[in-house]
């Protein structure tokens, strides 16, 4: 005897269509795009029913239910807005991702995603992953006047990339992105196998203040060309933080130099060094201090360090020098690893040109200069570490 004539569910169709269905005949149900087969509430990949000899189908008719993409992924440092309607996550629904203004910018796409027939939230470019909110780098409350200042006290937001590193001794670093710190290899060399011992503080102004954001190191990467106690060539290191930090006006990453950055780092261009290192009184500074200092001609600097007690060849092509011939304005012990920053006049963002590395026996000595790791030489190294880890 024939089985009851099957009726396709709403938003579905059956195949093959026959005048009647008898023993061993079968039909399949296919749903329209944006709808999925459900048996009860359970999704089916496919459905086929067979007519049995008692004249009944071997299984009940499924339904074609609208595809539900489910709640979209949260966006760290951003938010998601339902455009179609509150909490609507079904086929053709639209959502809009956006990043927290001022401190983050959206990478990858425009943030608009649609619930597609395959059940995935998809951007106009076909991406299924949510966009990324990247921290905006190089923002500072400070504007440069190009003048030379000596030992000025920093104000909140002036150097939001400044990182205080406490381990064996006091050192500094600069925040990159939201989970990396750029510093000098010599400053953290002793802790290279014990990253967790580094006490990393962000958003601090006073060295001893309890008001700061605590961070801890997950891993330390020291440049493979750096040799401890054998000069300061390749004096550069990266610290990966075990958590991303929240970016705000007091904690903002420094930019890495663009290819064009050297045009803002010529001889006599002004850079700014900041830190809690030794001051003229011979004590570590309580308040974050900064000094605006000019870049010194490389040959002039090399010559300055060829006289005893310095050995010839101390200043390499991987270094840049800054300071005054008359002395008095310099980085010092405790400032190691901190950034020498420059303003990119085109983007109006600050970038790191140098890392406080070494200098004369007596800081700020006349005729001697502060020596900094030349960051632009290490962009491939930095990017390689960050992308791989």
């Amino acid at each position: 005897q024939p089985c009851p004539y099957p009726m396709a569910p709403p938003n579905g169709h059956l195949s093959p269509v026959q005048a009647k269905y008898i023993l061993k005949d079968s039909f399949s149900i296919f749903c329209e795009p944006g709808y999925e087969l459900l048996q009860g509430h359970l999704p089916l990949k496919s459905f086929a029913a067979v007519c049995q000899k008692d004249g009944s189908w071997d299984q009940p008719m499924p339904s074609c239910s609208i595809v539900d993409c489910g709640p979209p992924d949260d966006l760290p440092s951003g938010r998601v807005e339902y455009i179609t309607g509150p909490e609507v996550t079904t086929y053709k629904a639209v959502i809009q991702y956006s990043c927290e203004e001022t401190f983050y910018t959206m990478k990858v796409n425009d943030g608009k995603y649609v619930c597609e027939a395959d059940g995935f939230w998809t951007s106009s470019k076909g991406e299924r992953s949510p966009p990324v909110c990247e921290p905006v780098c190089g923002l500072s409350a400070r504007t440069t006047g190009g003048q030379i200042y000596g030992g000025q006290k920093a104000k909140p937001g002036d150097f939001p990339w400044q990182v205080l590193i406490l381990g064996g001794s006091t050192a500094a670093g600069a925040l990159l992105y939201d989970n990396w710190v750029l510093t000098a290899a010599h400053a953290i060399y002793e802790q290279k196998h014990d990253a967790s011992s580094l006490d990393i503080r962000l958003g601090a102004l006073k060295r001893l203040s309890p008001h700061y954001t605590q961070a801890w190191a997950e891993a330390v990467f020291i440049h493979e060309g750096y040799t401890h106690d054998a000069g300061f060539d390749n004096d550069i290191a990266l610290i990966k933080l075990n958590n991303k930090v929240v970016i705000n006006s007091n904690i903002t990453p420094i930019c890495l130099p663009r290819k064009e950055a050297e045009s803002f780092m010529r001889t006599d261009d002004i850079g700014t060094a900041s830190g809690w290192g030794l001051t003229q009184r011979g004590l570590l500074a309580r308040n974050l201090m900064y000094v605006d200092i000019p870049i010194v001609d490389h040959q002039k600097c090399t010559a300055a360090y060829e006289k005893p007690p310095y050995s010839g060849g101390s200043v390499t092509a991987n270094m840049l020098c800054a300071g005054l011939e008359s002395g008095g304005k310099d980085a010092c012990r405790g400032d190691s690893g901190g950034a020498l920053v420059f303003l990119d006049n085109e983007t109006q963002r600050w970038f790191v040109g140098g890392i406080v590395s070494w200098g004369s026996m007596n800081c700020g000595e006349a005729g001697q200069y502060g020596v900094y790791t030349k960051v632009i030489n290490y962009i491939p190294w930095i990017k390689n570490i960050i992308s791989n880890f």
């Epitope: 459900l38 048996q39 009860g40 509430h41 359970l42 999704p43 089916l44 990949k45 496919s46 539900d68 489910g70 059940g119």
Partner: antibody, heavy 118, light 107 residues
Framework: QVQLQESGPGLVKPSETLSLTCTVS??????????WGWIRQPPGKGLEWIGS???????YYNPSLKSRVTISVDTSKNQFSLKLSSVTAADTAVYYC??????????WGQGTMVTVSS | SYELMQPPSMSVSPGQTASITCSGD??????AYWYQQKPGQSPVLVIY???KRPSGIPERFSGSNSGNTATLTISGTQAMDEADYYC?????????FGGGTKLTVLG
Amino acid sequence: QVQLQESGPGLVKPSETLSLTCTVSGGSISSSSYYWGWIRQPPGKGLEWIGSIYYSGSTYYNPSLKSRVTISVDTSKNQFSLKLSSVTAADTAVYYCARDRRGRFDPWGQGTMVTVSS
Amino acid sequence: SYELMQPPSMSVSPGQTASITCSGDKLGDIYAYWYQQKPGQSPVLVIYQDNKRPSGIPERFSGSNSGNTATLTISGTQAMDEADYYCQAWESSTGVFGGGTKLTVLG
């Protein structure tokens, strides 16, 4: 954010009935999008699905437990319950409740340990 | 009754790819689901309908299902991924779980 919390006695005597309740917070049990399920896990062993219920009272059970299981729902209290009769030591397990959305269990309750012992 | 089989244990080095398999008769014809369970915690859904990731699950988790085998792949495995993993499927409206695979991340 929906949360589920199991409650009930931690010790049940053999041959008696195990009774547990799952309280749903942060969402309505009467949502048409979800079933609500019970899953258990004997100590050191894997997961076993017990059964699921819709807010209307429609149920489906694991055939191996069907003769002993009753799952019910109380929409006024935003709760659903499990009863397992004639228990033995083999029913000793952590019992979880979970939201069942189109066949996927998410989220789960924290679980409650039930020991069957005299 | 329908059965899903998983290897009881497997190990992987950090940063490497872990592939956990789940086999069952014509499993590829139905949807597979994967759950992660860390010691003393409730299970967490990591993959549903073969290859879909719930909100909040890292992109390193992916899934596939064809023939008689479903696979959960964890690329760039991290120490935090050490856990028990269970596959699950629905056969004739009955929920079935695999026996679970204990994933150890070495080092």
